[in-house]
Amino acid sequence: FERTRSLQDPCSNCPAGTFCDNNRNQICSPCPPNSFSSAGGQRTCDICRQCKGVFRTRKECSSTSNAECDCTPGFHCLGAGCSMCEQDCKQGQELTKKGCKDCCFGTFNDQKRGICRPWTNCSLDGKSVLVNGTKERDVVCGPSPADLSPGASSVTPPAPAREPGHSPQ
């Protein structure tokens, strides 16, 4: 099949880094400067991506692979192949159209990107709040209130009894 295909289509023999040049009777030609083809059999080479402005070069373009960009400090990638850079915010904030805003009460964000999310509702799992939430951290749920009632077995062992006549240090 490969042999048949190459007889029918000479372009199928052109390797990555080249293109099938119609101006040269369909012979394979190397990609011109600042262009690439990452697969064989291409009829054109693609122009290399340029990482400009808020983008910076993570991997240089070559004749067989496109450049790869990431974002300058203070920004993070969004989209396939880092197609966009979005401003970082602080933990406890989210990015709005008006810039970085603190998370509303009852929500948190523990990253420099993304949106503020509601604190976990411990009571939905029948548990109680062990550590309160903040703008930067979710609440920590603890044992259910029933586990803390008198007579119930405690998760932590009881403190050793003090000898009489000694006050705590």
Partner: nanobody, 111 residues
Framework: AVQLVESGGGLVQPGGSLRLSCAAS????????RSWYRQAPGKQRELVAW???????HYADSAKGRFTISRDNTKKTMYLQMNSLKLEDTAVYYC?????WGQGTQVTVSS
């Protein structure tokens, strides 16, 4: 325009070696892609080896492991070292620098 002149072709036995040279005259300093092609009788011209614009050497499957492309910018010369030559390597070999072609040099592999 750039003028290219190949040399180094000849008659060699199977398994032998040849070194082709391609001397350039004119302004070659902005030329970033160099390549060797060959054309066997009755066949289409084919790309054998090339130095891409990113200075990486590439080879057609038929040349991998046997041929080595190199260049010496101070001498304005490109080379193709051909080892372990086979009967099917018989062709006229052309050097190319973007839009300029040499006149070709004949390589014949025969016992």
């Amino acid at each position: 325009a750039v003028q290219l002149v190949e040399s180094g072709g000849g008659l060699v036995q199977p398994g032998g070696s040849l070194r082709l040279s391609c001397a350039a005259s004119g302004n070659i300093f902005n030329i970033r892609v160099r390549s060797w092609y060959r054309q066997a009788p009755g066949k289409q011209r084919e790309l054998v080896a090339w130095i891409a614009w990113d200075n990486v050497a590439h080879y057609a499957d038929s040349a991998k492991g046997r041929f080595t492309i190199s260049r010496d910018n101070t001498k304005k010369t490109m080379y193709l070292q051909m080892n372990s030559l086979k009967l099917e390597d018989t062709a006229v070999y052309y050097c190319n620098s973007e839009d300029s072609w040499g006149q070709g040099t004949q390589v014949t592999v025969s016992s």
